[in-house]
């Protein structure tokens, strides 16, 4: 008789999940000399240990501490780029501006980027059929808790001027319920971080509005100011041109507003 399996609302674990995590770890440590000391088999064992045999709605940050310890990484604290609902452009930016880092440019962020995973209570099996959805099932699921944990640590490490890319095409440009709004904003350290600079990315070609005046941006400014961190905001009217000018800053068209 087959054992009854919990049917969750979200997609199941990404195919070849263990192999992908291990392979990404090996690739990352080969490319980044400062992480060559990392033992990728131990990283996988710690990752697996965080969720295997545990109820996928009862995962805690504590479960991920062994993995966090193994993946400890020093990134230049004044070169951090946060993002909310605009991952693609943020990653395209750091691919060009190689001295800046998103969370997914770190070892732990890269390991889990685009992946889904969960286990089952009391069995060593990985659930490839379904995993809990944050909204429909539970928030303390393996994926959500992982990103909450690494995002908090990433924000805590930031210093000087921290940049955040926000999606100007969304109804809530700043969303208090996003990882940025609920975790990262509250874990920037006022004694280390001088300024949070928001880059609001415009979607439409003809959109010339000053989205820095948007009520949700004002809300962000208020939260940040109350935490004794300065706030500044820039409109990026032409994201395509913005990237082009990051690639070729000497281009004559790059002196005008983008």
């Amino acid at each position: 008789v087959p054992r009854w399996r919990q049917q969750w609302s979200g997609p199941g674990t990404t195919k070849r999940f263990p192999e992908t995590v291990l392979a990404r770890c090996v690739k990352y440590t080969e490319i980044h000399p400062e992480m060559r000391h990392v033992d990728c088999q131990s990283v996988w064992d710690a990752f697996k240990g965080a969720f295997i045999s545990k109820h996928p709605c009862n995962i805690t940050e504590e479960d991920y501490q062994p993995l966090m310890k193994l993946g400890t990484q020093t990134v230049p604290c004044n070169k951090i780029l946060l993002w909310s609902r605009i991952k693609d452009l943020a990653h395209q930016f750091t691919q060009v501006q190689r001295d800046m880092f998103t969370l997914e440019d770190t070892l732990l962020g890269y390991l889990a980027d685009d992946l889904t995973w969960c286990g089952e209570f009391n069995t060593s099996k990985i659930n490839y059929q379904s995993c809990p959805d944050w909204r429909k099932d539970c928030s303390n699921n393996p994926v959500s808790v992982f990103w909450k944990t690494v995002s908090r640590r990433f924000a805590e490490a930031a210093c000087d001027v921290v940049h955040v890319m926000l999606n100007g095409s969304r109804s809530k440009i700043f969303d208090k319920n996003s990882t940025f709004g609920s975790v990262e904003v509250h874990n920037l350290q006022p004694e280390k971080v001088q300024t949070l600079e928001a880059w609001v990315i415009h979607g439409g070609r003809e959109d010339s509005r000053d989205l820095c005046q948007d009520p949700t941006i004002k809300e962000l400014e208020s939260i940040i100011s109350k935490r004794n961190i300065q706030f500044s905001c820039k409109n990026i009217y032409r994201p395509d041109k913005f990237l082009q000018c990051v690639k070729n800053p000497e281009d004559s068209s790059c002196t005008s507003e983008i």
């Epitope: 070849r16 192999e19 992908t20 291990l22 392979a23 990404r24 090996v26 690739k27 990352y28 991952k87 693609d88 990653h91 691919q95 997914e104 980027d113 685009d114």
Partner: antibody, heavy 126, light 107 residues
Framework: QVQLVQSGSEVKKPGASLHLSCKAS????????MHWVRQAPGQGLEWMGV????????TYAQKFQGRVAMTTDTSTYTVYMEVNSLRSDDTAVYFC???????????????????WGQGTTVTVSS | AIRMTQSPSSLSASVGDRVTITCRAS??????LAWYQQKPGKAPKLLIY???SLESGVPSRFSGSGSGTDFTLTISSLQPEDFATYYC?????????FGQGTKLEIK
């Protein structure tokens, strides 16, 4: 959801060049290989080559070496393929297809293709 | 280049039948083999990867087995929507190569 959208049909004369595009969405573009596969009318599938968008390195089937160039634009999540010196036997449907996670593929030698574009019909005729 | 040989090249069967298609590699490829289904005018669709792993969303009547040089795709009980052409592909090394295809037709 993961999607690959290819450029429209083309009619070309022998000797001309062909430029095809494949725009990806729904996943982290630089984390996966992109393959090109073609299929002549009534024939089987033929692998042409692959590009790694993380860095742009390419590998081509020997048959197409020197006549094909694959490039990528990470700012638009688009992969391009140029085929030069077209001949009538280049008449085919050209598919782009997403490969495995590139770290996984290289580590385990596992180069399958899980998502395909809709195909671009190319006719080469004088 | 690794040569992939599929058999049979065509096959007639009825709804409900159990069908097996075989694929042989000219040299060992471990379990790096994929199976695709293609319908006329459509792009191929991945069914099986790593010789025996079922791609997400593919019905469980499809299964794959084998390693090294000999592989099989089995459809346990044919459904009307399964009539199509099936290709194996070695996923072990460049250049990637496909079998010539097996056309599965209604008897």
């Amino acid at each position: 959801q993961v999607q690959l959208v290819q450029s429209g049909s083309e009619v070309k004369k022998p000797g001309a060049s062909l430029h095809l595009s494949c725009k990806a969405s729904g996943y982290t573009f630089i984390n996966h290989y992109m393959h090109w596969v073609r299929q002549a009318p009534g024939q089987g599938l033929e692998w042409m080559g692959v590009i790694n968008p993380r860095g742009g390195s390419t590998t081509y089937a020997q048959k197409f070496q020197g006549r094909v160039a694959m490039t990528t634009d990470t700012s638009t999540y688009t992969v391009y393929m140029e085929v030069n010196s077209l001949r009538s036997d280049d008449t085919a449907v050209y598919f782009c297809a997403r490969g495995s996670d590139n770290a996984l593929a290289d580590y385990y030698n596992s180069y399958d293709m899980d998502v395909w574009g809709q195909g671009t019909t190319v006719t080469v005729s004088s | 280049a690794i040569r992939m040989t599929q058999s049979p090249s065509s096959l007639s069967a009825s709804v409900g039948d159990r069908v097996t298609i075989t694929c042989r590699a000219s040299q060992g490829i471990s379990s790096a083999l994929a199976w695709y289904q293609q319908k006329p005018g459509k792009a191929p669709k991945l069914l099986i990867y790593d010789a025996s792993s079922l791609e997400s969303g593919v019905p469980s009547r499809f299964s794959g087995s084998g390693s090294g040089t000999d592989f099989t795709l089995t459809i346990s009980s044919l459904q009307p929507e399964d009539f199509a052409t099936y290709y194996c592909q070695q996923a072990n090394s460049f250049p990637l190569t496909f079998g010539q295809g097996t056309k599965l037709e209604i008897k």
